[in-house]
Amino acid sequence: DSEEDEEHTIITDTELPPLKLMHSFCAFKADDGPCKAIMKRFFFNIFTRQCEEFIYGGCEGNQNRFESLEECKKMCTRDNANRIIKTTLQQEKPDFCFLEEDPGICRGYITRYFYNNQTKQCERFKYGGCLGNMNNFETLEECKNICEDGPNGFQVDNYGTQLNAVNNSLTPQSTKVPSLFEFHGPSWCLTPADRGLCRANENRFYYNSVIGKCRPFKYSGCGGNENNFTSKQECLRACKKGFIQRISKGGLIKTKRKRKKQRVKIAYEEIFVKNM
């Protein structure tokens, strides 16, 4: 009886790490806010994957702001995050690449990718939207970078840094710069509004990248995509500040707000947040 057989193949939770490497707010850019105080705070930089110092103006800003380095590390870095870097440097896959795909206990029909240890490839699966495990990537590219072997036996990490197989050094990858202004907020801010597959009518906001504004839409309650916010303020905070201006070698741009110019160091070049 096949039903009986399947009861003996329950996928157990042995040593499964939590789903998310960090909280969603850890991915927010450092935001000094509109006020003029000079307060030393810490934020998690998703590009360097480290907690770094920044100057906070004393009001507004976002949740990616911590009083101490320790608090920042506690909230935004986990052993798993360190393990990604460590194991990549050792040319090994992180442990979670070997976990079976886990849709989680919710059912939101979200397309995600996992590393299939049988086929040695990243494959698509339907994620339910909550819980699950860390073998769960938003893009095929990210999954491949972290869990698949590169063509020459090296691994590639997911922030544009390649591990050189010869001398184990981290080499920045060149990036094409098509224009002076680029969108460097979360990629989902560029996706269209997606109602999802359920039957609810929840009031949500999405970022309309064509007009550059947050607009309301009706969310079905499950599925959809990540361009989906419970408030206009949250939408603006996540997506509106994503437009940046690239300047060659350490130049500064003037911002509309009269206060010190603050550089935000990201990856391998200096970029500056354009206030909008």
């Epitope: 849709p103 206990i105 909550c130 949250e234």
Partner: antibody, heavy 123, light 112 residues
Framework: QVQLQQSGPGLVKPSQTLSLTCAIS??????????WSWIRQSPGRGLEWLGI?????????RYAVSVKSRITINPDTSKNQFSLQLNSVTPEDTAVYYC?????????????WGQGTLVTVSS | DIVMTQSPLSLPVTPGEPASISCRSS???????????LNWYLQKPGQSPQLLIY???NRASGVPDRFSGSGSGTDFTLKISRVEAEDVGVYYC?????????FGQGTKVEIK
């Protein structure tokens, strides 16, 4: 209307195994739009989630670390029920045990609960 | 584990008056596509818990509209616009951002 009917002994001796069953009517234990859980409640610890099982392309389970080495939750598809086994019990395991359905579709939450079974661990 | 802390632990109320219960999580419960991984339950005396609010702010079926949930990040609130006698019991918040699923310690609402 989903109903969960719990059964099992109310008294278990220390070091023995606590076994409870939750019979489901109005839904299927194999449903891909539900997950099935055990939760206990005691004055000292409040509501404590113990574990959950669910079937999607295959069966999955997750357990609380606090009981992980002692717990097993199994589905019984032929009887449309699921069970809890907790080994090597101590008086600290004395609690009201609830089975609950996690609604996986629109309403993400424990939307149906069993009536609760008071289990006392005592010699 | 994510720790859920409720306040107050006891709330004496007057029928017809509003009531508010706070729940604070040790980590943020907002997922990236706007869903808040927090539910509210009510356990009436001698009964099993029942789902009141799911995903932070959505009323479960059959729940009167005097109940509302709000909040984001780590701070959440359950409000009863006008308390009725049948609303007495213990209210719990619960997170499902990460395993293990955890509940608050409960807020006991009783009539003055």
């Amino acid at each position: 209307q989903v109903q969960l009917q719990q059964s099992g002994p109310g008294l278990v001796k220390p070091s023995q195994t606590l076994s409870l069953t939750c019979a489901i009517s109005g839904d299927s234990v194999s449903s891909d739009s539900a997950a099935w859980s055990w939760i206990r409640q005691s004055p000292g610890r409040g509501l404590e989630w113990l574990g959950i099982i669910y079937k999607r392309s295959k069966w999955y389970n997750r357990y609380a670390v606090s009981v992980k080495s002692r717990i097993t939750i199994n589905p019984d598809t032929s009887k449309n029920q699921f069970s809890l086994q907790l080994n090597s019990v101590t008086p600290e395991d004395t609690a009201v045990y609830y089975c609950a359905r996690w609604h996986s579709d629109k309403m993400w939450g424990f939307d149906d609960w069993g009536q609760g079974t008071l289990v006392t661990v005592s010699s | 584990d994510i720790v859920m802390t409720q306040s107050p632990l006891s709330l004496p109320v007057t029928p017809g008056e509003p009531a508010s219960i706070s729940c604070r999580s040790s980590q943020s419960l907002v997922f990236s596509f706007g869903t808040t991984f927090l539910n509210w339950y009510l356990q009436k005396p001698g009964q099993s818990p029942q789902l009141l609010i799911y995903k932070g702010s959505n009323r479960a079926s059959g729940v009167p509209d005097r109940f509302s949930g709000s909040g984001s990040g780590t701070d959440f609130t359950l409000k009863i616009s006008r308390v009725e006698a049948e609303d007495v019991g213990v209210y719990y918040c619960q997170q499902y951002d990460s395993y293990p699923l955890t509940f608050g310690q409960g807020t006991k609402v009783e009539i003055k």
